[in-house]
Interface confidence: medium
């Protein structure tokens, strides 16, 4: 064996955003014929020597960063990319609004504003059907998400979450959906 074994992938099914009380499975996927899998939760360090972790009822304590690796013979693989498992529904939902309007002419700009009943300093925006979140607004203006030169691809249903940077894996419930309509197509 020359060099470390390639890293496995770690995924949460059905999603890494898990409402409190719901179930989730973390699955580590390496090459065929692995001798041993190790799935770890970081801070505090806990691990299971298997390729999956079933969480039947999501609790606050389950939220956090996870990674996995595997062993073949005496060789350990590189660790997987870390997976952030988020508990949602920990706090009341924020409200999501569009400025100047949720009907936006193509090529113009719109700002989606997420407002929390708490003094949270972190907000994140998701579009239905997209795999990832829109940019975290520390680069922007707290709860404002500017979307520039809008196109038809930005039409759709958005939700936001709020949380505190001191507890980054404990999120609010999702906002009510906001439907963004791109006009003039």
């Amino acid at each position: 064996q020359s060099g470390p074994l390639p890293k496995p992938s770690l995924q949460a099914q059905p999603s890494s955003l898990v409402p409190l009380g719901q179930s989730v499975i973390l699955r580590c996927q390496g090459p065929p014929d692995v001798d041993l899998y190790r799935l770890e939760k970081l801070k505090p360090e806990k691990y299971e020597d298997q390729d999956f972790l079933f969480i039947p009822t999501m609790e606050r304590s389950n939220a956090g960063r996870y990674r996995c690796s595997y062993q073949n013979g005496s060789h350990w693989s590189l660790p997987s990319d870390q997976l952030e498992l988020i508990a949602t529904g920990v706090y009341a939902k924020p409200s999501l609004s569009a400025h100047p309007s949720s009907a936006v002419p193509q090529g113009r700009d719109v700002t989606l504003k997420c407002q929390s009943p708490y003094s949270f300093d972190e907000f994140v925006l998701y579009k239905e059907g997209d795999t990832g979140s829109y940019k975290r607004p520390e680069k922007w203006y707290r709860a404002n998400f500017p979307i520039i030169t809008v196109t038809a691809a930005h039409s759709g249903t958005y939700r936001c979450y709020s949380f505190s940077s001191s507890s980054p894996y404990l999120w609010s419930a999702p906002s009510d959906p906001l439907v963004l309509v791109v006009t003039g197509l």
């Epitope: 193509q106 090529g107 700009d109 829109y134 979307i147 030169t149």
Partner: antibody
């Protein structure tokens, strides 16, 4: 890899018409805004405007409105910049550039540039 | 449409640091985090060096960094190298599909 290939240099007389091109490869041409940028000899960069090839929606900077026309043919991944009547003051290097994005969201900068088309207008 | 204000030229010795300023208004630099920087060598097309004030595209050296305060953005080149000699342009989004560029700064490596 992602590339924008522009048409070759042009020498024209005042009053003539001209259409220069910018052919994209290596990405989904229809899904990114394309900008046209002018650079007059020894001067800085000026945004002329942008076009969305998906439906040829064009947006012109105020000082270029009515002076030029943008178009796009998504079947051949090509954007065009056109003049109906050239002036000596149109002498410049013209660049096409792609507005970059992360995921679905534009980040307000031009991440891929063509090599430029030099247009010389002289009697 | 007024350009953003940059110093026309700056110079420094190899290994030194140079910081280029780019001053606009609350309608452009101050109003958006969509400030970008481009490097242009003579006879070449511009190349994106930083976007969203301080983010480097892949392949750009970490010697290039950016920041913004109020209506002024800055590009810092640390550990200056001969190949950094070029013109540098800042740009800011100004809303509704329009951008403005700075007048450019010629950086000379002594």
């Amino acid at each position: 890899q992602v590339q924008l290939q522009q048409s070759g240099a042009e020498v024209k007389k005042p009053g003539e018409s001209l259409k220069i091109s910018c052919q994209a490869s290596g990405y989904s041409f229809s899904s990114y805004w394309i900008a046209w940028v002018r650079q007059m000899p020894g001067k800085g960069l000026e945004l002329m405007g942008i076009i969305y090839p998906g439906d040829s929606d064009a947006r012109y900077s105020p000082s270029f409105q009515g002076q030029v026309t943008f178009s796009a043919d998504k079947s051949i991944n090509t954007a065009y910049l056109q003049w109906s009547s050239l002036k000596a003051s149109d002498t410049a290097m013209y660049y096409c550039a792609r507005q970059g994005k992360t995921g679905s969201y534009y980040f307000g900068a031009f991440d891929v540039w063509g090599q430029g088309t030099m247009v010389t207008v002289s009697s | 449409q007024s350009v953003l204000t940059q110093p026309p030229s700056m110079s420094a010795a190899p290994g030194q640091k140079v910081t280029i300023s780019c001053t606009g208004t609350s309608s452009d630099v101050g109003g958006y985090n969509y400030v970008s920087w481009y490097q242009q060598h003579p006879g070449k097309a511009p190349k994106l060096m930083l976007f969203e004030v301080s983010h480097r595209p892949s392949g750009v050296s970490n010697r290039f960094s950016g920041s913004k305060s109020d209506n002024t953005a800055s590009l810092t080149i640390s550990g200056l190298q001969a190949e950094d000699e070029a013109d540098y342009y800042c740009s800011s989004y100004t809303g509704s599909s329009t951008w403005v560029f700075g007048g450019g700064t010629k950086v000379t490596v002594l």
